[in-house]
Amino acid sequence: FSPLRRISIKILVHSLFSMLIMCTILTNCIFMTMNNPPDWTKNVEYTFTGIYTFESLVKILARGFCVGEFTFLRDPWNWLDFVVIVFAYLTEFVNLGNVSALRTFRVLRALKTISVIPGLKTIVGALIQSVKKLSDVMILTVFCLSVFALIGLQLFMGNLKHKCFRNSLENNETLESIMNTLESEEDFRKYFYYLEGSKDALLCGFSTDSGQCPEGYTCVKIGRNPDYGYTSFDTFSWAFLALFRLMTQDYWENLYQQTLRAAGKTYMIFFVVVIFLGSFYLINLILAVVAMAYEEQNQ
């Protein structure tokens, strides 16, 4: 080994070197949280970049760059260090127009903490392993969601557009003429029935067990879907999103009530099956796989 490499190895294995890097990263994180940093922090930024460059140079000199088994770029954690340094120099010395997007990558510096703290490194390793093991469960989940999304699409397509429409019109007005002029919230509130405090028109249905309209109103299929058009089963993608919402139980009872009001109470069976299969079974299966992966990593 050359004297330069021997010195680099001595520095790399020294505990003070690890401490210096850890303190630098933590200080850097504190500086990144500043709202309006003073001008002198620019020099501090250069110092941080200098320390990170020095760290990487020491590692490259001690282990080699990329040829060989244990070299710098063969360790995935060093890829992070390399990217941090490259972006630091890119944002500083290369004029790339809108640099603010690239400056976002400075946040990656905080992730360097993981490679420095051994316990954290183990946990992240376990997390990555669990993600690898999750692939099969994820495929099963996406498949199940897709199947139920297709069923939902067939059962409820267009149903959430059913609204209670006013039974009194001007002489020149017809359903279609109104449909063509509906634009503002004011227009909607003029022709449709709204429950007090509701941001969407009252839903209704055409089957006997679905929601009925109050006196003076008739159920029609007009306008957009509830929740600014985001809640529907009109396309596979929207149906998939609705099913994902059921699986994660994200305000699912509202979707349940809306759909049952528009389609009929019989369809509660669909929701029972989805909640049992998707929410109780699949979610717990995912958790079980993650738990197994952590257990394996610990052993």
């Epitope: 429409f165 359903l175 006196e215 008739t218 029609v220």
Partner: nanobody, 124 residues
């Protein structure tokens, strides 16, 4: 195919009467907001004559008030327009309009569904 069948038109003397009927020939008509009669005289725009809402309340054009009566038979899915004291200016093609929701089998569709029209001629 959505079909509204109008009948009862013809030639009548001023002061005479006619009864127009509009039947929904298909069970795909689910629920109307209203079913009404419109007319279009030669060279003029189509205008409302009378309409009846699904709850039974009616609405008439000023020219039809007191002379014309609109009614419905829900069992037969038919709407009638009884026209009395007819005048020459009532001469027009009378159209039936179902404004509401139909079922295509796969989905529900709301909109305006017009009949072919029946000709009413008031002449001495």
């Amino acid at each position: 195919e959505v079909q509204l069948v109008e009948s009862g038109g013809g030639v009548v003397q001023p002061g005479g009467s006619l009864r127009l009927s509009c039947a929904a020939s298909h069970r795909q008509f689910i629920r109307d907001v209203f079913t009404g009669w419109y007319r279009q005289a030669p060279g003029k725009q189509r205008e409302l004559v009378a309409r009846i809402y699904n709850e039974g309340n009616t609405q008439y054009a000023d020219s039809a008030k007191g002379r014309f009566t609109i009614s419905r038979d829900n069992a037969k899915k038919t709407v009638y327009l009884q026209m009395n004291s007819l005048r020459p200016e009532d001469t027009a093609l009378y159209y039936c309009l179902f404004s509401g929701t139909i079922s295509t089998g796969r989905e529900y569709r709301s909109g305006d569904y017009w009949g072919q029209g029946t000709l009413v001629t008031v002449s001495s």
